[in-house]
């Protein structure tokens, strides 16, 4: 048996998806014109930082790229970054790689991702399209911290694999 990350399309309540622009993740309206990323999600094997109240411990990566989401402090503020890293390398580490870890919690049918390194900081999208995905403490109207994970594998013949691999233009504002 070989562990493998699960694949999801991700969107928020305003139907904005995540798009790779260079080495940054930005939010863009779900559209024929953009190619959304497929999120790779895999559970962390090390239980050091486990907290079931906060959710499952997961690593997040971008499918088809050796890129993973991680959190670091920049000028005193927790910041969401993409780092060149294979998600399976993180998974295979015996010790949890804290900067790359997120608590994945379900709120109804939506998902919330909280940084393990910076408790109370959540992955968010702005209500304005073309803005980077970021970390916020402000949950609510302006910042969307609730996401819908749409399964890419199986899924009743959704044809998502074909759609995502089709030729799309890269997002630009």
């Amino acid at each position: 048996w070989q562990a493998a990350p699960k694949s999801y399309a991700i969107r928020d309540s305003r139907q904005m998806v995540w798009v790779l622009s260079g080495n940054s993740l930005i939010a863009a309206p779900l559209s024929n014109r953009v190619k959304p990323v497929t999120l790779h999600l895999i559970t962390c094997r090390d239980t050091e930082f486990s907290d079931k109240k906060k959710g499952n411990l997961v690593y997040l990566g971008i499918r088809g790229k050796d890129l993973c989401l991680f959190c670091e402090e920049i000028q005193g503020k927790p910041t969401l970054q993409l780092k060149e890293k294979n998600i399976m390398d993180l998974y295979m580490e015996k010790k949890a790689q804290k900067p790359f870890l997120f608590f994945h919690n379900k709120e109804g049918s939506s998902s919330v991702f909280q940084s393990v390194s910076y408790p109370g900081w959540f992955i968010a999208t702005s209500s304005t399209s073309g803005q980077p995905i970021f970390l916020t403490q402000e949950r609510g109207i302006t910042n969307n911290t609730n996401f819908y994970l749409d399964s890419v594998e199986g899924g009743g013949g959704s044809g998502l694999n074909d759609i995502f691999e089709a030729q799309k233009i890269e997002w630009h504002e």
């Epitope: 399309a9 863009a28 559209s31 899924g155 959704s158």
Partner: antibody, heavy 122, light 112 residues
Framework: ELQLQESGPGLVKPSETLSLTCTVS??????????WGWIRQPPGKGLEWIGS???????YYNPSLKSRVTISVDTSKNQFSLKLSSVTAADTAVYYC??????????????WGQGTLVTVSS | ESVLTQPPSVSGAPGQRVTISCTGS?????????VHWYQQLPGTAPKLLIY???NRPSGVPDRFSGSKSGTSASLAITGLQAEDEADYYC???????????FGGGTKLTVLG
């Protein structure tokens, strides 16, 4: 081939609740990445989106109708339904159910029911 | 008042080309959400004519085409035929409303 069929009373009294059901055939209401919607069309007028529900159970409602609308899914019957409370004559319309797929129709509706006329009158 | 604005009516003779405009705002078409077009023949349900701004579902003749620029979109019909006489609606998604929006509809009359 996916098909949708609306059903429900054609006459509703003012102040009562309008209830309609859309039966899905040729596909599953729980199909991944699918959303289901209700749209209405008053006689001689244009289309108005009422609300939608998707395969995750998330609901989205027209702000102008939100306080009166409930959309729900019955997976065992492969149906989704609309309830519109406190109706008035202004709610008289042909009601359509429709569907689309997030990553294939990009928030458009590619399959529609034939529509059912609901008249609000005492 | 519709969120998306369309002309109430357009007309053309058989064989001619007509266009129908659809004007939105920065929270729908201008926010890069796609525009879809529907054809509604008299007494029938709407039918998807164009999706994702400029894509035709299978079975829709290539006489129908869509385009989008800025906060507006348009539907073009070339080689107009009598059976094209119908109402046409544009539709998009509005993030400020967190919902789907339609244009008011345009009645196409084929003259003669």
């Amino acid at each position: 081939e996916l098909q949708l069929q609306e059903s429900g009373p054609g006459l509703v009294k003012p102040s009562e609740t309008l209830s309609l059901t859309c039966t899905v055939s040729g596909g599953s209401i729980t199909a991944s990445n699918t959303y289901w919607g209700w749209i209405r069309q008053p006689p001689g007028k244009g289309l108005e989106w009422i609300g939608s529900i998707d395969y995750t159970g998330s609901t989205y409602y027209n702000p102008s109708l939100k306080s009166r609308v409930t959309i729900s899914v019955d997976t065992s019957k492969n149906q989704f339904s609309l309830k519109l409370s406190s109706v008035t004559a202004a709610d008289t319309a042909v009601y359509y159910c429709a569907t689309g797929k997030y990553y294939e129709t990009y928030l458009g509706f590619d399959v529609w029911g034939q529509g059912t006329l609901v008249t609000v009158s005492s | 008042e519709s969120v998306l604005t369309q002309p109430p009516s357009v007309s053309g003779a058989p064989g001619q080309r007509v266009t129908i405009s659809c004007t939105g705002s920065s929270s729908n078409i201008g926010a890069h959400y796609d525009v879809h077009w529907y054809q509604q023949l008299p007494g029938t349900a709407p039918k998807l004519l164009i999706y994702g701004n400029d894509n035709r579902p299978s079975g829709v003749p290539d006489r129908f085409s869509g385009s989008k620029s800025g906060t507006s979109a348009s539907l073009a019909i070339t080689g107009l035929q009598a059976e094209d006489e119908a109402d046409y609606y544009c539709q998009s998604y509005d993030y400020s409303l967190s919902g789907y929006v339609f244009g008011g509809g345009t009645k196409l009359t084929v003259l003669g």
